[in-house]
Amino acid sequence: APVRSLNCTLRDSQQKSLVMSGPYELKALHLQGQDMEQQVVFSMSFVQGEESNDKIPVALGLKEKNLYLSCVLKDDKPTLQLESVDPKNYPKKKMEKRFVFNKIEINNKLEFESAQFPNWYISTSQAENMPVFLGGTKGGQDITDFTMQFVSS
């Protein structure tokens, strides 16, 4: 069966949008008006993985780009990166684990936990214009809660 995907944007709980910062990095900042067009549109694919009522495994690709968010060890630390893939082979139902995030829904907010590194989450800083990263703490200074906005194809 083909993998199912939809297009969406993500904003953190402080309403910061995600934009490209160089070829392989995302940053989070407040956008208004026409600047909203800068925000990244994700192609969220619903992939194979452990699922429960509030946890759904997804992969996060950048729409119409052969880039996916992935989680790897760098200097012994779980790290978020944008990884280039062969567009002929992606997306697929059985994504490699580094590409898989557990989309967890709590009180209408979403968290994205790395499947590769449990308890590590896609995170943003309180500060403006800082990189999106993989954080190992919830409920602290860093932001791990997001909302999803659906975008028509």
Epitope: A1, R4, L6, F46, I56, E105, M148
Partner: nanobody, 123 residues
Framework: EVQLLESGGGLVQPGGSLRLSCAAS????????MGWVRQAPGKGLEWVSS????????YYADSVKGRFTISRDDSKNTLYLQMNSLRAEDTAVYYC????????????????WGQGTLVTVSS
């Protein structure tokens, strides 16, 4: 052409049981995650349950967990929903859905669904 034909609905007393079936044709049934959604009178669609391709994983809405059991028989291209301990609030039209993917708690994607079968729970 994809076809999904539900059956097994009817009138049942509270606490009773029903088994719904969905006969599928027109696609490679075993390759697809399948599921059930329902629509109560005057309400929107509600996800009930899903089963993965190969049937090794099952998922349930909190409202039916422990009472309903989803299963599939790939040799017969048929999806089932065993409903026990039925309650008045289970009254709804039940639809079988092909390639059902749950996006959020209240949003689903699916490619096809059947015409539905009515389940009425009443004394």
């Amino acid at each position: 052409e994809v076809q999904l034909l539900e059956s097994g609905g009817g009138l049942v007393q509270p606490g009773g049981s029903l088994r719904l079936s969905c006969a599928a044709s027109g696609f490679t049934f075993e390759d697809y995650q399948m599921g059930w959604v329902r629509q109560a009178p005057g309400k929107g669609l509600e996800w009930v349950s899903s089963i993965s391709a190969m049937g090794n994983r099952t998922y349930y809405a909190d409202s039916v967990k422990g009472r309903f059991t989803i299963s599939r028989d790939d040799s017969k291209n048929t999806l089932y929903l065993q409903m026990n301990s039925l309650r008045a609030e289970d009254t709804a039209v039940y639809y079988c859905a092909e390639n059902l993917v749950r996006v959020t708690a209240r949003k689903w994607m699916f490619d096809y669904w059947g015409q539905g079968t009515l389940v009425t729970v009443s004394s």
